[in-house]
Amino acid sequence: YHGCPSECTCSRASQVECTGARIVAVPTPLPWNAMSLQILNTHITELNESPFLNISALIALRIEKNELSRITPGAFRNLGSLRYLSLANNKLQVLPIGLFQGLDSLESLLLSSNQLLQIQPAHFSQCSNLKELQLHGNHLEYIPDGAFDHLVGLTKLNLGKNSLTHISPRVFQHLGNLQVLRLYENRLTDIPMGTFDGLVNLQELALQQNQIGLLSPGLFHNNHNLQRLYLSNNHISQLPPSVFMQLPQLNRLTLFGNSLKELSPGIFGPMPNLRELWLYDNHISSLPDNVFSNLRQLQVLILSRNQISFISPGAFNGLTELRELSLHTNALQDLDGNVFRMLANLQNISLQNNRLRQLPGNIFANVNGLMAIQLQNNQLENLPLGIFDHLGKLCELRLYDNPWRCDSDILPLRNWLLLNQPRLGTDTVPVCFSPANVRGQSLIIINVNVAVPSVHVPEVPSYPETPWYPDTPSYPDTTSVSSTTELTSPVEDYTDLTTIQVTDDRSVWGMTQAQSG
C-alpha cells in the first residue's frame, strides 16, 4: 500500500502501526495516504524536524509508550489535517514553544503520563479548535494565568495526578464550553472563590485526593449544569451552608474520606437527580433532623465508618426512594423507634459494628420491603417481640457477634430464628454470651431450661412464622449480601481512572455486591 516500512503494518484503511523495541527512529518511507499512524512501545528517544512531512493527510497520530524525551519544534510541520495527537506515556520534560503551530484542525491533544514540569500560554496559543487536553500524570506544580485562554472550544481538561499546590482563580476563566475538569490527585489545599465561575457548561468536576481543607461558600454557584462532583479524600472539615445550593443537575457527589464533623440541615440543597451520596470515612458524630430532606430521589446513602452516636428521629425525612442505607462501623448505642419510618422503599440496611444494646420494637415498622439487615457485632442481648414479623421479603439477617442473653426472655426470638434459619446464613450463627454456663452455644438450639435451671419458663408466644422465601417468584443471586468483599468507593467512571479497591471485613458498607459498584 504505497510502500510500508518493514517495521510497521499497514492496513487497507490507511492505518499504519509501528511497534517494537528495535525501532529507534520514525520509520520511512511512510505511505503518503496514511490517515492514522501509531508508533508504540519503541525505543525512539527524539523526534527531529519534519519526520511526517510526506503524510499530510494524517488525521490521527499516536506516539505512545516510547522513550521519547526530546522533540524538535518543527516535528509536526505539514500536519494541518491532524485532529488527534497523543504523546502520552513518554519521557517528555519540556515542550518546545511552537510545537503545535500549524495544527489548525487539532481537537484532541494527549500529553498525559510524561514528566512535564511546566506549561506556558504560548504552548497552546495556536490550538484554537482543541476540544480535549490531557495533561494528567505529569510533574506540573503550577499553571500560569493565560495557559488556556485561547482554548475557548475546550470541552475536556485533565490536570489530575500532578503536583499542583494552588490554582489561580483566572486560569479557567475563558473555558465557557468546558464540560469535564479533572484536578484529582494533586496537592491543592484550597480553591479560590471564583475559580470555576466561568465554567457555565461544566458537567464533571473531579477534585478528589487533594488536601483541600475549606470550600468557599459560592465556589460552585455558577456551575448549574454540574452532574458529577468528586470531593472525596480531602481534608474538608466543614461544608458552608450554601455550598451545594445551586446544583440542580447533580447526580453524583462523593465526600468520603474527609474530616467532616457535622452536617447542617439542608446542606444538600435541592438535588432532584442525586441517586447516591457517599459520606463514609469522615468524623460525623450526629445527624440532625432533615439533613437529607432535599434529596428526594436518593437511593444509596453511605454513612459508614464515621463516629455517629446520635441520629435525630427526623434525620432521614424526605428519603422516600432510599434503597440502601449504610450506618455500619459507627458509635450508635440507641436508635429512636421512628428513625427509619420514612424509608418506605428501603431494601438493605447495615448496622453492624456499632454499640447497639437494644432496638425499639417498632424500628422497622414501616420498612416492609427490607431484604437484608446486618446487625452483627453490636451489643444486643435480646430483640423485641415481633420485630421482624412483617418483613416478608427479608432473606438476609445477620445477628452473630452479639452478647445474646439466653434466659427465658430469649425464647420468642429463638423460636422465630428456628423457623427462619435460612435467613441467618450458614457461616456464622448467633451464640449465647450469658449466662456463663451456656456461653458459646448456638442461640438457635439452646435449651433455655438448661440455661436458667432455677426459673420456671412460662409459655411464651413465639414469633409468628414468616416464610423465608421472598414474595417474588425468582430472586437473583446478585442481591445476596456480602460484607467481606466489596468495593470501597464508588467507581468514578473515568476512562483514564478506573481503580477499584477491594478490602477486608472493615469494608465500606456491607451491602450487596451488585449495588456496591
Epitope: A331, Q333, D334, Q352, N353, R355, R357, Q358, Q376, N377, Q379, Y400, D401, P403, D427, T428, V429, V431, F433, S434, A436, R439, G440, Q441, D505, R506
Partner: antibody, heavy 120, light 112 residues
Framework: EVQLVESGGGLVQPGGSLRLSCAVS????????VHWVRQATGKGLEWLGV???????NYNSHLMSRLTISKENAKSSVYLQMNSLRAGDTAMYYC??????????????WGQGTTVTVSS | DIVMTQSPDSLAVSLGERATINCKSS????????????LAWYQQKPGQSPKLLIY???TRESGVPDRFSGSGSGTDFTLTISSLQAEDVAVYYC????????FGGGTKVEIK
C-alpha cells in the same frame, strides 16, 4: 483448662511488620472473642482490638490503619498483624478472652504476653 | 475516643487501711436504657498479666475478695480497697467499654 499462649515476638526493624500468634486451648474460637492488649515497659495498658466468635473485628481507631486481627478456628489460633512498626510499638503484647465474666468487653483470662522490640 | 483519667498516679497506704482510687471519663459511661455504667477495674501485679476485678462499675468478678468494691456513675468512679493486704500491691487500671475500650493511665498502690 483455659489457656492463651502468645508467640511471635522479638526484634523488628522500624518500618517492618510483625505477626503475633495467640494459641488458645480449653475453649473454641467459634464461641468466644479474643482481644489484643499491649503494654510498653513501665507504661499503661492499651487495647488494640478484638476478633469475635463470628469473625467480626473491632480496632483501636488510632492504630486501625496498621492492624489486622484474624483467626483460624480449626487451629485455635488468633493472629495480630501490625505494619509500619516504629519505636513506640515496643511493648509486651497480650491476648485475652471473656471466659466467665458477664461483661462482654471484660477480659478475665490473659496470656503471659510476648515481647516485641522495634529497633534498628 | 473516650479519655480515662486516673488519680492519683501512685498511692501509699498502710496495711489494713483503706485505699481509694479515682477514675474520671471524658463522657458519661451510663447507658440510660440498660442502666449500666460500662466501667471495669483491673489489677496488675508486678511481672503478671492483668486481672479483672470489677465490671459495670460495681459488680465484683467471681473470686474477687469483697474488700474490693467499685462505685460511681456517669463520669466519676472509685475503686476502694477497704483493708489493704500485702498481696494487693499492684497497679490498678480503669477501663471504659461504653465505646471501644480505653484504659486509664494506672494507679500504683504500695504499702506505707
Amino acid at each position: 483448662e483455659v489457656q492463651l499462649v502468645e508467640s511471635g515476638g522479638g526484634l523488628v526493624q522500624p518500618g517492618g511488620s510483625l505477626r503475633l500468634s495467640c494459641a488458645v486451648s480449653g475453649f473454641s474460637l467459634t464461641s468466644y472473642g479474643v482481644h489484643w492488649v499491649r503494654q510498653a515497659t513501665g507504661k499503661g495498658l492499651e487495647w488494640l482490638g478484638v476478633i469475635w466468635a463470628g469473625g467480626s473485628t473491632n480496632y483501636n481507631s488510632h492504630l486501625m490503619s496498621r492492624l489486622t486481627i484474624s483467626k483460624e478456628n480449626a487451629k485455635s489460633s488468633v493472629y495480630l498483624q501490625m505494619n509500619s512498626l516504629r519505636a513506640g510499638d515496643t511493648a509486651m503484647y497480650y491476648c485475652a478472652t471473656h471466659m466467665i465474666t458477664e461483661d462482654y468487653y471484660g477480659m478475665d483470662y490473659w496470656g503471659q504476653g510476648t515481647t516485641v522490640t522495634v529497633s534498628s | 475516643d473516650i479519655v480515662m483519667t486516673q488519680s492519683p498516679d501512685s498511692l501509699a497506704v498502710s496495711l489494713g487501711e483503706r485505699a481509694t482510687i479515682n477514675c474520671k471519663s471524658s463522657q458519661s459511661l451510663l447507658n440510660s436504657r440498660t442502666r449500666k455504667n460500662y466501667l471495669a477495674w483491673y489489677q496488675q501485679k508486678p511481672g503478671q498479666s492483668p486481672k479483672l476485678l470489677i465490671y459495670w462499675a460495681s459488680t465484683r468478678e467471681s473470686g474477687v475478695p469483697d474488700r474490693f468494691s467499685g462505685s460511681g456513675s456517669g463520669t466519676d468512679f472509685t475503686l476502694t480497697i477497704s483493708s489493704l493486704q500485702a498481696e494487693d500491691v499492684a497497679v490498678y487500671y480503669c477501663k471504659q467499654s461504653y465505646n471501644l475500650p480505653t484504659f486509664g493511665g494506672g494507679t500504683k498502690v504500695e504499702i506505707k
